[in-house]
């Protein structure tokens, strides 16, 4: 099992407020577009524009997901796209609310095994590699809604039905209530609410803030774990360097996470993953002799 895998990597074991951002609603700069004597104006934002072929990508992803996951075959992907589009088209991209995404949330309803949830922060690729091997565990991006939007950018314009492919609001420089940020806040909150029993979170030990209060995990998910359902949050701190034998579970930011979690009446535990490559290999082949004894 996973415990043997942890042991095999000399993993140290330790038992063990929502941060609001005050951003201005950036007005952006107005640049003329179109030709002819009457200029039409488009908002210029600081962030990259909508991902090219966004509608086609969302629809194709929906079709692919529902083909692979039999329990989601009933989903009408055209309706899903219409609901997704309806959340941001013709709306000011700095004035998006969770309510705008409610129709999409309803159409994307998908029961996730509550004790098989893996959260992550700043280490998405490894988290996804892990759930691709450990098929009974789920990140948000393993759900239909997360899969649809992963790595995409999108926004519209107030009072026009056009998608803005030139630029979209940047979370820091422009505004936090933009279509992408509000989407991830909405689905992340609901995903965290679903969790029960032992919840795992993968954290990046190479970053200066291993636990960052300003990340989606730190600002949304941590605060929406339900203490009456969740017994323990178990952090897996992923080491970057091959010779890095420090106990990153003693990092001040991890202690801060432990404090936040404990105040919410949820137990906290932490494990170092010193060799992520070895860790993944042992998840794939737990019978390997090097995975059952201390290295």
């Amino acid at each position: 099992g996973l415990n043997d895998i942890f042991e095999a990597q000399k993993i140290e074991w330790h038992e063990g407020s929502h941060h609001h951002h005050h951003h201005h609603h950036g007005s952006g700069s107005l640049v003329p577009r179109g030709s002819g004597s009457v200029p039409r104006w488009r908002q210029q934002w600081s962030g990259p524009g909508t991902t090219k072929r966004f509608p086609e990508t969302v629809l194709a992803r929906c079709v692919k997901y529902t083909e692979i996951h039999p329990e989601m075959r009933h989903v009408d992907c055209q309706s899903v796209w219409d609901a997704f589009k309806g959340a941001f088209i013709s709306k000011h991209p700095c004035n998006i609310t969770e309510e705008d995404y409610q129709p999409l949330m309803k159409l994307g309803t998908q029961t996730v095994p509550c004790n098989k949830i893996l959260l992550w922060s700043r280490i998405k690729d490894l988290a996804h590699q892990f759930t691709q091997v450990q098929r009974d565990m789920f990140t948000l991006e393993d759900t239909l809604l997360g899969y649809l939007a992963d790595d995409l950018t999108w926004c519209g314009e107030f009072n026009t039905s056009k998608i803005n492919y030139q630029s979209c609001p940047d979370w820091r420089k422009d505004c936090s209530n933009n279509p992408v940020s509000v989407f991830w806040k909405t689905v992340s909150r609901r995903f965290a609410e679903a969790a029960c029993d032992v919840v795992h979170v993968m954290l990046n030990g190479s970053r200066s803030k291993i636990f960052d209060k300003n990340s989606t995990f730190g600002s949304v998910e941590v605060h929406n774990l339900q203490p009456e359902k969740v017994q323990t949050l178990e952090a897996w701190v992923i080491h970057g360097g091959r010779e890095d034998s420090r106990d990153l579970c003693q990092d001040p930011t991890i202690k801060e996470l432990e404090s936040i979690i404990s105040k919410r009446n949820i137990q906290f535990s932490c494990k170092n993953i010193y060799r992520p490559d070895k860790f993944l290999q042992c998840v794939k082949n737990p019978e390997d002799s090097s995975c059952t004894s201390e290295i």
């Epitope: 329990e71 009933h74 989903v75 009408d76 309706s79 129709p103 949330m105 309803k106 159409l107 994307g108 309803t109 998908q110 029961t111 996730v112 095994p113 509550c114 004790n115 759900t143 809604l145 689905v187 609901r190 995903f191 609410e193 679903a194 029960c196 029993d197 339900q226 009456e228 359902k229 017994q231």
Partner: antibody, heavy 122, light 107 residues
Framework: QIQLVQSGPGLKKPGESVKISCKAS????????MHWVKQAPGKGLQWMGW????????TYAADFKGRFVFSLEASASTANLQISNLKNEDTATYFC???????????????WGQGTSVTVSS | NIVLTQSPATLSVTPGESVSLSCRAS??????IHWYQQKSNESPRLLIR???QSISGIPSRFSGSGSGTDFTLSINRVESEDFSIYYC?????????FGSGTKLEIK
């Protein structure tokens, strides 16, 4: 207050159809999925399935595929259960119950209709 | 499908006694178990959600515990109005299931 009010009892002959309605009030209809539960005389609760009150998509338990149809009159905040080609073993009380839909989870059934008794007899 | 096995099928007690009702799941379901009480000729009523979370308006003598596969509904000092049938239900899977019920009767 939250209420689920079901239609009245029915006496039917084998082969006939019956439609049971469940009218919701006191909450936002589309925030909660609607589930249907069968209870045969002297027996336990048997989950029949549920309907997504936003999309209208039904999900049926294995034993209730075929003759059973869940539908909505969303504008009237009403869910319906239709049973066609009635058989003697359909004699039961049928309950509707609401469940909060949290996208990735369902809360328990926290409000129930009063039940509709259906008797199938020749 | 997740199978929920309730035991015992019938429990005979005298008022004032304390009792425990068991619900066992065929696979680990975290804390996704809920308990209902159904009195004769009435609709079921939610007693406990997510294994141990109490419900507003439900007397404090009802409590729940457990996680994984084994769950317990406890009634501290049974009162006469408690004699009825108790069901567990899981919401771990999108295909909901109920246990077969435990009938609490007067000895």
């Amino acid at each position: 207050q939250i209420q689920l009010v079901q239609s009245g009892p029915g006496l039917k002959k084998p082969g006939e159809s019956v439609k049971i309605s469940c009218k919701a009030s006191g909450y936002t209809f589309t925030d909660y999925s609607m589930h249907w539960v069968k209870q045969a005389p002297g027996k336990g609760l048997q989950w029949m399935g549920w309907i997504n009150t936003y999309s209208g998509k039904p999900t049926y338990a294995a034993d209730f595929k075929g003759r059973f149809v869940f539908s909505l009159e969303a504008s009237a905040s009403t869910a319906n259960l239709q049973i066609s080609n009635l058989k003697n073993e359909d004699t039961a009380t049928y309950f509707c119950a609401r469940c909060y839909d949290g996208t990735f989870y369902y809360d328990p059934m926290d409000a129930w209709g009063q039940g509709t008794s259906v008797t199938v007899s020749s | 499908n997740i199978v929920l096995t309730q035991s015992p099928a019938t429990l005979s007690v005298t008022p004032g006694e304390s009792v425990s009702l068991s619900c066992r799941a065929s696979q680990s379901i975290g804390t996704s178990i809920h308990w209902y009480q159904q009195k004769s000729n009435e609709s079921p009523r939610l007693l406990i959600r997510y294994a141990s979370q109490s419900i507003s308006g439900i007397p404090s003598r009802f409590s729940g515990s457990g996680s994984g596969t084994d769950f317990t509904l406890s009634i501290n000092r049974v009162e006469s109005e408690d004699f009825s049938i108790y069901y567990c239900q899981q919401s771990y899977s999108s295909l909901v299931t109920f246990g077969s019920g435990t009938k609490l009767e007067i000895k």
